[in-house]
């Protein structure tokens, strides 16, 4: 079972992931982003459910498409290159979800825009941070 120190580490990793996702969302929503309309045409798969750490498998599987869309944005909207940003997120996601490789993601029927996708995973981080005991 997780110890209080491992749970604290998990909380900190979730907070880091949350900040990264919020930074991406803020960069995309920046009123100076001329590529926003184009970026909103890309579709992302949404998890059927995302309430637990193992559901991060669904985020991991969408990181490559996310990187591709972010490459469209002007780099000055972000502190890091999309490749480095996604690499950082991937490291956190892998640590959080653990090595349960047999766990397959299931997706909702409806696809989402990048903004809806990011908001979904921001909500996920916030909910786990607030309910993890």
């Amino acid at each position: 079972a997780p110890t209080s120190s491992s749970t604290k580490k998990t909380q900190l990793q979730l907070e880091h992931l949350l900040l990264d996702l919020q930074m991406i969302l803020n960069g995309i929503n920046n009123y100076k982003n001329p590529k926003l309309t184009r970026m909103l045409t890309f579709k992302f798969y949404m998890p059927k459910k995302a309430t637990e750490l193992k559901h991060l498998q669904c985020l991991e599987e969408e990181l490559k498409p996310l990187e591709e869309v972010l490459n469209l944005a002007q780099s000055k909207n972000f502190h890091l290159r999309p490749r480095d940003l996604i690499s950082n997120i991937n490291v956190i996601v892998l640590e959080l979800k653990g090595s349960e490789t047999t766990f397959m993601c299931e997706y909702a029927d409806e696809t989402a825009t990048i903004v809806e996708f990011l908001n979904r995973w921001i909500t996920f981080c916030q909910s786990i941070i607030s309910t993890l005991t």
């Epitope: 193992k54 996920f124 993890l132």
Partner: antibody
Framework: EVQLVESGGGLVQPGGSLRLSCAAS????????LAWVRQAPGKGLEWVAA???????YSPDTVRGRFTISRDNAKNSLYLQMNSLRAEDTAVYYC???????????WGQGTTVTVSS | DIQMTQSPSSLSASVGDRVTITCKAR??????VAWYQQKPGKAPKSLIY???FRYSGVPSRFSGSGSGTDFTLTISSLQPEDFATYYC?????????FGGGTKVEIK
Amino acid sequence: EVQLVESGGGLVQPGGSLRLSCAASGFTFSSYTLAWVRQAPGKGLEWVAAIDSSSYTYSPDTVRGRFTISRDNAKNSLYLQMNSLRAEDTAVYYCARDSNWDALDYWGQGTTVTVSS
Amino acid sequence: DIQMTQSPSSLSASVGDRVTITCKAREKLWSAVAWYQQKPGKAPKSLIYSASFRYSGVPSRFSGSGSGTDFTLTISSLQPEDFATYYCQQYYTYPYTFGGGTKVEIK
């Protein structure tokens, strides 16, 4: 056949403690998230706590710090340790299995907890 | 927390009637909504998951629909054993939240 059987309910004084148990059978217990849901007399359903397959635990503000959910995979059992009980904790407590990608699919019959002096 | 507003809180209907219960969420849930049936003194029974999929053994007269923020449970032809209280629930995010319930009574 999936079965969930709760036990441990009873009458307890305010400030007291109680430990509920849920014995599970008919599925691979260790692979599932399990939850406790309660229902106060004449009221609706309220999610109380959940524990996932990695034993991470989740609960709402209303019970955090007072209620602790745990599991024993070797015994196929789920527990809810309830401390500092209040009159508003009086309810039927149900154990439920949470499917990996969908909702609470199986429920126990419930055990009644009454907090009264 | 995501509030689930269920309506009506109660309704009276006759055997054979078509009954519709609605649930409105405060934010978009995609299809992460379930419906449960509960009879007095009994545990809830799972009816619908992912907004529109029936659990095994649930009669076809029960159907769910909706996505986003608005969801509906329909009983196409009410049977005597369907008189009960029905609850919607979101499992989009923790903490899970339930609607207030709809009590279906005999007219």
